[in-house]
Interface confidence: medium
Amino acid sequence: EELQVIQPDKSVLVAAGETATLRCTATSLIPVGPIQWFRGAGPGRELIYNQKEGHFPRVTTVSDLTKRNNMDFSIRIGNITPADAGTYYCVKFRKGSPDDVEFKSG
């Protein structure tokens, strides 16, 4: 069955200064490729976390994404402020050349 990206929480309420946990799981290991988290959708969406590369000091992963069989792509965002409000999407990419291709969004 084709991979699904599941974000089970419709909304997450967090007090200022606290940590937000954004849950995301994939239903399959195939296709191979990284997960990215974005705030918003469209060309102007904001990258929150990239499994493959980059430095995201406020973000930690809930599980160890380096493990081959991991399908939990949940993240924690620390020190939440009102400016962090918005809709967050967990997006699965398919490995491609030269660039990875967006495959499915939560």
Partner: antibody, heavy 124, light 113 residues
Amino acid sequence: QVQLVESGGGVVQPGRSLRLSCAASGFTFSSYGMHWVRQAPGKGLEWVAVIWYDGSNKYYADSVKGRFTISRDNSKNTLYLQMNSLRAEDTAVYYCARDTGSATTMWLYGMDVWGKGTTVTVSS
Amino acid sequence: DIVMTQSPDSLAVSLGERATINCKSSQSVLYSSNNKNYLAWYQQKPGQPPKLLIYWASTRESGVPDRFSGSGSGTDFTLTISSLQAEDVAVYYCQQLYIYPPTFGGGTKVEIK
């Protein structure tokens, strides 16, 4: 020729459900993202929802999130909008529209083909 | 959500004269990766669905007369009808597609003076 034809509109009571359909012809339906856009009587345009060409991604306006579901059947060249928990403010002409972005484009840049619309009236 | 503000609400122009419609977005719709503004213009005649005129702020859709032109970048955009024809009487909408939800301006009604 390229055509979109909506159906399924009508008069419905608040809290009830309705399913709109949009039949596509004249182009490769499975290669295009599709939208629903609505227009309340005498008002402007309001985007409702979009679905990717392959159904993989769906996005909704906040005003309908959790109540409306967009879906498609590429084998039938048909787009759907399941509308639940309808409210008076959902009263509008509902248009389906083709996304200019196809399977090869990440993001749309306009809606280039529109149906004539189907009217939904929510009233007790 | 990005708010799109159109001005004026309505416009009366003599046949053959220039009509100018403005659209301002509450944040930039310029995508730095491809240097394109994700802004479209539509024409809606009474009793008809909208018709795409312009995309990427200034690219004319196929089949649209060249009297229609779009300009601007970032947050400020303009639709110009260089020589108004009777068939141009309609409501014109701008729309941003940079951040979902794609949002429309309130519309500008163009009439013959």
